[in-house]
C-alpha cells in the first residue's frame, strides 16, 4: 500500500471530566470517498485499538454504540474526542487513517498524541 502523511498534535491534556480532543489531519492523494479512522494507544511498547470508524466523505463518523470515541470530519480533517479517561489511561494515542475507496488503498499513521489524564481530587466531605 502507498504511505500517506498523517498529522496530529504532540500533546493534549484531558479535561477534569476525562475528555480529550484532538485533530487528525491526513494528506489525501486522490479523492477518497470512504475513509477508515482508527485510534491506537501505545503504552509500555504495547499497542491496543481504542476505537475505529469508517465513514463516507461528507458524513459523520459512526463509532460503535459502546465506543469511548466520538468524532466529526471536515475535508481531510477528523476531530476526535475520547471520553471516560482516567489517569491510568495516560499514553500515546496514535491516529491511523486508511483510504478505503476508491482504490488504490492508502495507509497513514500519525506520530501520536501524548494524552495526559489527571484524576480530579475527590471533594472533601462537608457538613451542613
Amino acid at each position: 500500500c502507498k504511505a500517506m502523511h498523517v498529522a496530529q498534535p504532540a500533546v493534549v491534556l484531558a479535561s477534569s471530566r476525562g475528555i480529550a480532543s484532538f485533530v487528525c489531519e491526513y494528506a489525501s492523494p486522490g479523492k477518497a470517498t470512504e475513509v477508515r479512522v482508527t485510534v491506537l494507544r501505545q503504552a509500555d511498547s504495547q499497542v491496543t485499538e481504542v476505537c475505529a470508524a469508517t465513514y463516507m466523505m461528507g458524513n459523520e463518523l459512526t463509532f460503535l454504540d459502546d465506543s469511548i470515541c466520538t468524532g466529526t470530519s471536515s475535508g481531510n480533517q477528523v476531530n476526535l474526542t475520547i471520553q471516560g479517561l482516567r489517569a491510568m489511561d495516560t499514553g500515546l494515542y496514535i491516529c491511523k487513517v486508511e483510504l478505503m475507496y476508491p482504490p488504490p488503498y492508502y495507509l497513514g499513521i500519525g506520530n501520536g498524541t501524548q494524552i495526559y489524564v489527571i484524576d480530579p481530587e475527590p471533594c472533601p466531605d462537608s457538613d451542613f
Partner: antibody, heavy 114, light 111 residues
Framework: EVQLLESGGGLVQPGGSLRLSCAAS????????MSWVRQAPGKGLEWVSG????????GYADSVKGRFTISRDNSKNTLYLQMNSLRAEDTAVYYC???????WGQGTLVTVSS | QSVLTQPPSASGTPGQRVTISCTGS?????????VHWYQQLPGTAPKLLIY???NRPSGVPDRFSGSKSGTSASLAISGLRSEDEADYYC???????????FGGGTKLTVL
C-alpha cells in the same frame, strides 16, 4: 508473499454460465478493493468488474453489465465472478487483482465456443 | 476504444531512452487520481511497474520512472535493454465509469 489463485475457467457454450473464484493469501484481504481484469487473445487489458472491501460498492464494465456479478467472502479470503449469458467475445484470460491491480494472479482461461 | 490513449508501439536501441505517453481526461487522470503502469512480458501475467504516478515497487530498476501532469502521464525507460521488450499499460480510477480504466497498451521493441 501475496498470492492470488484463480480457478473455474474452462470451455463453455454461448449462453452458458461459469463461476470464477480467486483465493487470496499473504495480505489483509478484507482491507482491499478487488478486481477482475481480462485479456482476450492478442488484445489488451480490460477491467471487467471491481468490488470494495465491504462489498458496498461494485462496478462493471459496460460490456458485462447485467450478465456478470462480482462478490466476495472476506471470511474465506475469496473473490468470485459469476458469469451468465456468455458470448464468444467473453473469451479471454481472466485475472484476479488486488487494489488498483497492484498484484495479479496467473489467470484462468475462459473459452466461449460452440 | 480505450478511455486512456497510448501509442500502439514504441521502439529504441539498447542504451537509449524511450517515453510512453498515456492521455486521459478530467474524470480520471485530470481528477487527481494516481496513474499506475504495468509491464507484460510475452506469455506472462502483467506486473506492476510504477504505482502512484512515480513510485517503483521493490525490485523494479530505477531505469523506469513515471510522471504525471494535467490529464496525461508518461513512463520513461532509460538505458534500454533487450529484456525491456514487452507490452506496457497505464491504468487509473475513473469517476464517471466507477471503475478502473486501462490504456490500450504500447508494444515496446528493442531494435
Amino acid at each position: 508473499e501475496v498470492q492470488l489463485l484463480e480457478s473455474g475457467g474452462g470451455l463453455v457454450q454461448p449462453g452458458g454460465s461459469l463461476r470464477l473464484s480467486c483465493a487470496a493469501s499473504g495480505f489483509t484481504f478484507s482491507d482491499y478493493y478487488m478486481s477482475w481484469v481480462r485479456q482476450a487473445p492478442g488484445k489488451g487489458l480490460e477491467w471487467v468488474s471491481g468490488i470494495s472491501w465491504s462489498s458496498r460498492d461494485k462496478g462493471y464494465a459496460d460490456s458485462v453489465k447485467g450478465r456478470f456479478t462480482i462478490s466476495r467472502d472476506n471470511s474465506k479470503n475469496t473473490l468470485y465472478l459469476q458469469m451468465n449469458s456468455l458470448r464468444a467475445e467473453d473469451t479471454a484470460v481472466y485475472y484476479c487483482t488486488t487494489d488498483l491491480a497492484r498484484y495479479w494472479g496467473q489467470g484462468t482461461l475462459v473459452t466461449v465456443s460452440s | 476504444q480505450s478511455v486512456l490513449t497510448q501509442p500502439p508501439s514504441a521502439s529504441g536501441t539498447p542504451g537509449q531512452r524511450v517515453t510512453i505517453s498515456c492521455t486521459g481526461s478530467s474524470s480520471n487522470i485530470g481528477a487527481g487520481y494516481d496513474v499506475h503502469w504495468y509491464q507484460q512480458l510475452p506469455g506472462t501475467a502483467p506486473k506492476l511497474l510504477i504505482y502512484g504516478n512515480d513510485n517503483r515497487p521493490s525490485g523494479v530498476p530505477d531505469r523506469f520512472s513515471g510522471s504525471k501532469s494535467g490529464t496525461s502521464a508518461s513512463l520513461a525507460i532509460s538505458g534500454l535493454r533487450s529484456e525491456d521488450e514487452a507490452d506496457y499499460y497505464c491504468a487509473v480510477w475513473d469517476d464517471s465509469l466507477n471503475g478502473v480504466v486501462f490504456g490500450g497498451g504500447t508494444k515496446l521493441t528493442v531494435l
